[in-house]
Interface confidence: low
Amino acid sequence: KSPVFGPQEVSSVEGNSVSIKCYYPPTSVNRHTRKYWCRKGASGRCITLVSSEGYVSSNYAGRANLTNFPENGTFVVNIAQLSRDDSGHYKCGLGINSRGLSFDVSLEVSQGPELPNGTEVYTVDVGRTVTIKCPFKTENAPKTKALYKKIGQTSVLVIDSRNYVNPNYKDRIRLRIPGTGQLIFTVVIDRLRLSDHGLYLCQAGDGSNRDEKNADLQVLEPEPELVYEDLRGSVTFHCALGLEVANVAKFLCRVNSRETCDVVINTLGKRDSAFEGRILLNPQDKDGSFSVVITGLRKEDEGRYLCGAHSDGQLQEGWPIQAWQLFVNEESTIPRSPTVVKGVAGGSVAVLCPYNPKESQSLKYWCLWEGAQNGRCPLLVESQGLVQEQYEGRLSLLQEPGNGTFTVILNQLTTQDAGFYWCLTNGDTRWRTTVEIKIIEGEPNLKVPGNVTAVLGETLNIPCHFPCKFSSYEKYWCKWSNTGCQTLPSQDEGPSEAFVNCDENSRLVSLTLNPVTRADEGWYWCGVKQGHFYGETAAVYVAVEEKKVAGSRYVSPAKADAAPDEKVLDSGVREIENKAIQDPRLFAEEKVVADTGDQAGGSRASVDSSSSEEQGGSSK
């Protein structure tokens, strides 16, 4: 049962006002989330009439408001100048109309004496279905049944029981006559158009004994819900079109200056290139509802968006739609951060991800956008540490610098890492952002040995060369684990000859493991940073082996060559990624990655730290 509570039924008379109070649990989230009052259509979809974000529909303009009282967990909907047209089923709720916490309210407005007697009012959304009920007396049971539309002073035949169908209603109307004993016939009109709006007349029989019933059909074009989002932020369009179209192709389109609607994304695989890397169409629920997420909002994304259903995956008249008017606020609370980050093959990137600073305790995530079909974004890493297996040793999410920004570091880059990545949290969804990683020509600035085999109980020295441009940066070594990278004590060893293109001597920072233990096996990162802002990193895998007989410390040239090793690893990663593309959650079990010695291939190069040139030569 929904925790939102309010009056189940409200009744009044025309011209009067009502004040409907709805209660909700006054949790912090509830107090600040959107409140709405919406009207349920024939299919069950609920069209917003008034909301706490300032939206008021045209037929409520000047006579309704919604006031939130967060301190005591209530909101009040005031509606004045009631008319019989206001009778119907409504919801007061929190969040999103189609999916939020809500309470059903039935509003019944009795008709005033000035209204003609017996007119049934049907209020239905465009694209939906209406069933008009037409009662008749027993004596007219065998006689012709018909539905007319009143246009001015004339009545135009729409359908009758002699199989006539007006061309304007072809293939979307049927007249049903029940079995004996039931004194009512129905006319069902599907895929309603705005032009179907108007007064209809049911008729059974002819002459003075004929039965007549007036029906007022009001076909509503969906009022666009006003959506205000921040520049660089994210928007989610939740689309609930009803069970009638659950198995029909879905789309989101944007209305252009010609008042046609350009497809942004659809379930048939079409996607506007302007949204590449920053859009997902989420899977349908069984009721046919779906949602579209767009990140990295730009000013040019503003406009009127429609979601709908049609076998062609694009807008067609007479099919159900839902509408939004998106406004992108340029005075954004979301800070500027690079939308493109460049790295070189073998090198690294450090991506800054913004999040709502009020939600510092939220879980942070980083996912890889995949464009196949409707788009997906399988998670690669999260702040509680779990990393996808194929990213072991080269991906870490850091809480630094904090206060609204976290950092994701990815190293050992290959061309396969080029693509779009999303920063997100389990908090404010509007703070989702997109960054594109591009792999460019060049050499990594930091140089470390390819892979290292350490001998149990002995001393291991791992050098990391950095160019003079990093001389003012803080240098560090850390041991990677699936929960982060633990900084280790390291030693700045002064000049090195590894870089010859530098005016002053390049430098060296070393990590010493003494004595080497089994626990030392794993990935180590050398990196540079300035304060809490991270720069480049380089990774080296240390394998630990038992002490061998004398002389075995010096490995054969074949074993020292790390390059084939890396190719094996690379092709292995490619294989894994190919599987991940087919089934992106393949590696999403978030299981703890074991630090095993064979993660990067079987052979490891031993590094003699006495020669900086030799180390430079074995760097990636």
Partner: nanobody, 130 residues
């Protein structure tokens, strides 16, 4: 280590009721979604029901075969989920597995797909006798 522990399974007569519970614990675990799947001998794992939430918004899903008979709910903290089974039938006999997820649920997840759930319990057996 995240743990999901199911309880409440057992023998029940056709037409009777049963309430299953699933408690999540470990690593300050606060899931976005919890759900129930079942697996009868020789059959694939079948979606039963799920509940997911984000802030003040709650979504409940129920599989077609149990619609109108089973309901899913959770405790206020969101770490325990319940499956209320009413009007049970012999075909409801199965091992019932609890599943949980900490992924933001509107990022390309279909709750009916077992692959899209990160954590699983060991299961509790429900036997419906005729």
């Amino acid at each position: 280590e995240v743990q999901l522990v199911e309880s409440g399974g057992g023998l029940v007569q056709t037409g009777g009721s049963l309430r299953l519970s699933c408690a999540a614990s470990g690593r300050t675990f606060s899931p976005y979604a919890m759900g129930w799947f079942r697996q009868a001998p020789g059959k694939e794992r079948e979606f039963v029901a799920a509940i997911r939430w984000s802030g003040a918004t709650t979504y409940k899903y129920v599989g077609d075969s149990v619609q109108g008979r089973f309901t899913i709910s959770r405790d206020a903290a969101g770490n325990t989920v319940y499956l209320q089974m009413n009007s049970v039938k012999p075909e409801d006999t199965a091992v019932y597995y609890c599943a949980a997820d900490r992924v933001p649920k509107d990022i390309s997840i279909d709750p009916r797909n077992p692959k899209d759930w990160d954590y699983w319990g060991k299961g509790t057996l429900v036997t419906v006798s005729s």
